[in-house]
Amino acid sequence: YDFTNCDFEKIKAAYLSTISKDLITYMSGTKSTEFNNTVSCSNRPHCLTEIQSLTFNPTAGCASLAKEMFAMKTKAALAIWCPGYSETQINATQAMKKRRKRKVTTNKCLEQVSQLQGLWRRFNRPLLKQQ
């Protein structure tokens, strides 16, 4: 999906008001220096591509973040402010809304969410030069 047509300011507002807090809640008890940021993005569409990938694509050691509150809100924000986004997700599991008891958070998931926090911060500062 090409995130170029998204309403970036609305997505930024959603992140600042609520998604960021959900990410912090997920990471509670973890030191901010515990993980190094290894994933980066160069502009807002690229950041959203990376955020979408890390949030919804299963990875080794972290099967699914999609049922987490920050993920639900991310999906909703992309759906309402990125035209056509949700239609590209038609074959994605519809079961994610059935909120089961949260599984034990693995270290790999914590690391992944730490990467997400970095991507979101970068998304909010699009004019900064890449380090």
Epitope: D2, N5, D7, K10, A14, T18, M72, K73, K75, A76, A77, L78, A79, I80, W81, P83, G84, S86, E87, Q89, I90, Q94, M96, K97
Partner: antibody, heavy 120, light 107 residues
Framework: QVQLVQSGAEVKKPGSSVKVSCKAS????????ISWVRQAPGQGLEWMGG????????NYAQKFQGRVTITADESTSTAYMELSSLRSEDTAVYYC?????????????WGQGTLVTVSS | DIQMTQSPSSLSASVGDRVTITCRAS??????LNWYQQKPGKAPKLLIY???SLQSGVPSRFSGSGSGTDFTLTISSLQPEDFAVYYC?????????FGQGTKVEIK
């Protein structure tokens, strides 16, 4: 089966406001985006905006920005569209529409429509 | 805003005919194109989404094709219940916009 039932026809004076409701039944409400689309007599379809009730996040067509407010009440599974500063050109049938997919803006299900007549 | 232009505006056809309606977008919309059918006094009904995917419950005589700027809705064998107005709608950019409609009438 998903059903969207809208409020009845309204006759309004120019300059006033109208609030149309859309009650959903037959499935969960909060995770499905509700959009509003209007159709002037004998004319085509025009998207006004939409909302995701879960979080109250809305998106409006620029044309209606500042004049339309879309809200949702999860407790009653009802979405609302309020249009202010009405003028004669706002005379139309107003439809609510919903997707069958979580957080989608596709219009799978439609309400029966509410005719709003603006006349002095 | 993306302009959607349908052609023809109206057409007359007989039961059993193959009918083709075209829709052109003012800019590239990839495959973010939906088709709706509307009968007098009724709400529209989704037929095709994503340019070519048939909505559940819609007869297979309806099909959609195209990508980019040019799209087609085809009814392979027109049935009495198919006489209606058909609208295309783009979903590539906000505001979501519709074509002006194509009225399919009985010859």
């Amino acid at each position: 089966q998903v059903q969207l039932v809208q409020s009845g026809a309204e006759v309004k004076k120019p300059g006033s406001s109208v609030k149309v409701s859309c009650k959903a039944s037959g499935g969960t409400f909060s995770s499905y985006a509700i959009s509003w689309v209007r159709q002037a007599p004998g004319q085509g379809l025009e998207w006004m905006g939409g909302i995701i009730p879960d979080f109250g996040w809305a998106n409006y067509a620029q044309k209606f920005q500042g004049r339309v407010t879309i809200t949702a009440d999860e407790s009653t599974s009802t979405a609302y569209m309020e249009l202010s500063s009405l003028r004669s050109e706002d005379t139309a049938v107003y439809y609510c529409a919903r997707s069958g997919m979580f957080y989608s803006i596709l219009f799978d299900y439609w309400g029966q429509g509410t005719l709003v007549t603006v006349s002095s | 805003d993306i302009q959607m232009t349908q052609s023809p505006s109206s057409l007359s056809a007989s039961v059993g005919d193959r009918v083709t309606i075209t829709c052109r977008a003012s800019q590239d919309i990839y495959n973010y194109l939906n088709w709706y059918q509307q009968k007098p006094g009724k709400a529209p009904k989704l037929l095709i989404y994503g340019a070519s995917s048939l909505q559940s419950g819609v007869p297979s005589r309806f099909s959609g094709s195209g990508s980019g700027t040019d799209f087609t809705l085809t009814i392979s064998s027109l049935q009495p219940e198919d006489f209606a107005v058909y609208y295309c709608q783009q979903q590539n950019d906000y505001p979501l916009t519709f074509g002006q409609g194509t009225k399919v009438e009985i010859k």
